[in-house]
Amino acid sequence: HPSPAPPDQLNTSSAESELWEPGERLPVRLTNGSSSCSGTVEVRLEASWEPACGALWDSRAAEAVCRALGCGGAEAASQLAPPTPELPPPPAAGNTSVAANATLAGAPALLCSGAEWRLCEVVEHACRSDGRRARVTCAENRALRLVDGGGACAGRVEMLEHGEWGSVCDDTWDLEDAHVVCRQLGCGWAVQALPGLHFTPGRGPIHRDQVNCSGAEAYLWDCPGLPGQHYCGHKEDAGAVCSEHQSWRLTGGADRCEGQVEVHFRGVWNTVCDSEWYPSEAKVLCQSLGCGTAVERPKGLPHSLSGRMYYSCNGEELTLSNCSWRFNNSNLCSQSLAARVLCSASRSLHNLSTPEVPASVQTVTIESSVTVKIENKESRELMLL
């Protein structure tokens, strides 16, 4: 297949809404449940998500929501928050009207004339906010995740089916399949579709084999494929890296723990703005790279790579992607240089002599099967041929 075309690289930030919402066909999602197919029902009202009113929640709406989310039908109505006939008592006659307050605080309702999402509509201020919220557990409690890839947008593909997390076999696994995964998870588009052993092998069942998505499906389980077969082992677990995944490296220093900060995001390496590159950001990066703590933030060079990233951390985050971040914002970066850092584990701090490497490219063979090219004595980047 041709690879899916990446969307335009707009200015983006961690605070923005997901690129793709699971309930695209119906402005609804389930939260605080065991998976994306169970939980409290929330509906989208313009820019915000609001809990759906429990008083008007019925089996038709539950069925419609589950179907719209690709989660099969709803479980028995007894599993829903039961409607309570005893509503808050009406005010005594002659009391001051509280209609304005009630309406301002009113909760939206998802009202359905049938069990199909096309027959539903969101009605604003349909209920008083009495604390009862619509909940549902769908029959096919399906979910999807990427694991062991250093973030929610990269890793081994796992599906939740019949209460068990399981892998997907890498037979016929390609960018179209990975694209569906990335979009379903709100992780942008697929940068890589990876065969087995790029990530740690999974355990448990293998739920799918011979997956063959067109790339247009909303859910991975909508793609043609076969149930996981016995001849597919965990050494063949499919993986994906999505455009919204961030990974980092330091280049141009004595080793991997010193140099210019670069982030791989949306398919390319980008520099980081030093205008807000403070000790807290440097500390998070050094720790996440396994390079100890930040010792110094040397003066950077002008930006040379295509995109620019800005981070703002409190210093306690595990990785820079957990910090507040913004991408390709020219205002933030226009006066900045490319951030650099020296981490405590760098050998340049320990006065260890660095052997000279000729500037010309060296080719080194390791274990007779892997050829490594050392391109540049500054960055010492290892690239598999």
Partner: nanobody
């Protein structure tokens, strides 16, 4: 106790129009979401239309969408149902309903029912 009194029912030809009214005794009328249900001979009561406290949100049964319009005038303590392009299958007793906690779309949230007014659509 809210007293709901419907009026405006009667006999009308197919394709014709009627306007139902529902007046309420309660001074806190604006604290209630209001609506209309109907019951045809030999059938169960069914939802027709609902409106929230101040009239900002409305909801209609699929069978009446585009033909019926619900509205309210809080200054007159009155609820209206404008019925256009009437069909024989709209023949029913129409009930005005009031609900404190939610728009009266499902029967379990309804606090008060009127006694009903008969609408007959026939040539």
């Amino acid at each position: 106790q809210v007293q709901l009194v419907e009026s405006g029912g009667g006999l009308v030809q197919p394709g014709g129009s009627l306007r139902l009214s529902c007046s309420a005794s309660e001074r806190t009328f604006s604290d209630y979401a209001l609506g209309w249900f109907r019951q045809a001979p030999g059938k169960e009561r069914e939802f027709v239309a609902a409106i929230n406290w101040v009239g900002g949100s409305t909801y209609y049964a699929d069978s009446v969408k585009g033909r019926f319009t619900i509205s309210r005038d809080n200054s007159k303590n009155t609820l209206y149902l404008q019925m256009n392009s009437l069909k024989p299958e709209d023949t029913a007793v129409y009930y005005c309903v009031a609900s404190w906690g939610a728009m009266p779309v499902l029967t379990h949230v309804i606090n008060y029912w009127g006694k009903g007014t008969l609408v007959t659509v026939s040539s």
